[in-house]
């Protein structure tokens, strides 16, 4: 028996549901009776599911996980997995004997957008050129941890005296917090980009300064 | 009409350096930042680097940080990207071109004709 | 880096027929410009924001994509349409370019 997954991770966002792709080819006159399927987490070899014996023997793993039976006797072995968690994030194997063996590995890479970033400015009153001042930029709820950039009005990166900071929180959902200190010129936007590296996904926010009062701008 | 006039062709030694330049008009010089982009056969476009024209802050392409330095005169307009330690390498059409956009969201606009720099001895 | 790769490197249209070239990132980018360059000249910019045409472009000319993949098209090729065009990506430093595809009549 050969058994076949997707070689390219399967990304699931946090709380959907994501499906584990794995099959085989049945010889004519397979029956069900023949089939034994493990899934487990390839590093720590925990039992994930299996069918064993002509049955289901339902999920080992948090009650979350579900076969397609109707599927398996045409070879699809894949595994639903619900109610995704950053903590599903890993490689799982799918094991299939009938008469001989095998196994092949998927990877899960769980993800989970960034909000739109929210600009503070400290301090945010009596600003003339040269003060220094400190803009953070806010993203929160995201996974994995998050690229950011920083950009002046002219689109030219600002790489200098940039500070970020990434904090997990019980779910394992990362709020990011950078911090640009600049000198003020006589006016200048600044621009924060909050990236998404599974996800391609980018957020961003930015603030003008012209003298007085500040400017948040709309998001294009 | 917005317009970027760029210096003359080089012909330079191998091992010195070349200081070329591009005057901006017809625009706020100060509100867009300029680009350096390089054009060989060997290896079509190459971006160089930026500099914001009105705080003189610089991005270089980690390729060309130590080969291209980029400066400002903003009462004249002008950027101006110095090569050094030349070699046949460089030999090269440079172009200057004008970054236009917003937020994270840019493209060049508007290009200089060219500076040929051709490196023999 | 952003690498960006066109294709084909070469092709060759006949008058009227519709030409299409592609431009694939390595990475999602948020739009794709395109640049025309015809011989000893320097780029003028072509496409912007992945769709939009410059201006003083002829309308035969198309931009689509997202992501990865995108790619520009000409619905009637004509004589004047000679060139190479480059795609850009100004999503992530250092910017880049594609090699070019260059275009040529037959």
């Known amino acids: 028996v050969e058994v076949q997954v997707s070689e390219d991770p399967v990304v699931a966002l946090v709380d959907t549901d994501a499906t584990l792709r794995c099959s085989f080819s049945p010889e004519p006159g397979f029956s069900l009776a023949q089939l034994n399927l493990i899934w487990q987490l390839t590093d720590t070899k925990q039992l994930v599911h299996s069918f064993t014996e002509g049955r289901d023997q339902g999920s080992a793993y948090s009650n979350r996980t579900a076969l397609f039976p109707d599927l398996l006797v045409q070879g699809n072995a894949s595994l639903r997995l619900q109610r995704v968690r950053v903590t599903d994030e890993g490689s799982y194997t799918c094991f299939v004997s009938i008469q001989d063996f095998d196994s092949a590995a998927v990877s899960l890479q769980v993800a989970a957008p960034y909000s739109k970033p929210s600009m503070t400015l400290e301090p945010n009153k009596d600003l003339r050129p040269g003060n220094m001042v400190t803009i953070t930029c806010s993203s929160y709820q995201g996974y994995p941890e998050a690229e950011v950039f920083w950009k002046d009005g002219q689109g030219v990166p600002l790489t200098g005296n940039v500070t970020t900071s990434q904090m997990a929180n019980e779910r394992g959902l990362f709020d990011v917090h950078s911090v640009l200190r600049v000198v003020l010129g006589a006016n200048g936007t600044y621009s924060c980009l909050v990236r998404n590296p599974v996800l391609q996904q980018d957020a961003h926010g930015s603030v003008t300064i012209t003298g007085q009062p500040l400017t948040f701008p709309p998001e294009a | 009409e917005v317009q970027l006039q760029q210096s003359g062709p080089e012909l330079v030694r191998p091992g010195v350096s070349v200081k070329i330049s591009c005057k901006g008009s017809?625009?706020?010089?100060?509100?867009?930042?300029m680009h350096w982009v390089k054009q060989s056969h060997a290896k079509s476009l190459e971006w160089i680097g930026v500099i914001n024209t009105s705080s003189g802050n610089t991005y270089y392409n980690l390729k060309f940080k130590g080969k291209a330095t980029m400066t400002v005169d903003k009462s004249s307009s002008t950027a101006y990207m110095e090569l050094a330690r030349l070699t046949s390498e460089d030999s090269a059409i440079y172009y200057c071109?004008?970054?236009?956009?917003?937020?994270?969201?840019?493209?060049?606009?508007?290009w200089g004709a060219g500076t040929t720099v051709t490196v023999s001895s | 880096d952003i690498v960006m790769t066109q294709s084909p490197v070469i092709m060759s249209a006949s008058p009227g027929e519709k030409v299409t070239m592609t431009c694939s990132a390595s990475?999602?980018?948020?739009?794709m410009h395109w640049y025309q360059q015809k011989s000893s000249t320097s780029p003028k910019l072509w496409i912007y924001?992945?769709?939009k045409l410059a201006s003083g472009v002829p309308g035969r000319f198309s931009g689509t994509g997202s992501g990865k993949s995108h790619s520009l098209t000409i619905s009637s090729m004509e004589a004047e349409d000679v060139a190479t065009y480059y795609c850009?990506?100004?999503?992530?430093?250092?910017?880049?370019f594609g090699s070019g595809t260059k275009l040529e009549i037959k």
């Open positions: 071109s004008k970054y236009y956009g917003s937020s994270f969201h840019w493209y060049f606009d508007v």
């Open positions: 017809g625009y706020t010089f100060t509100d867009y930042s």
């Open positions: 850009f990506q100004g999503s992530g430093y250092p910017l880049t």
């Open positions: 990475s999602s980018v948020s739009y």
């Open positions: 924001d992945t769709s």
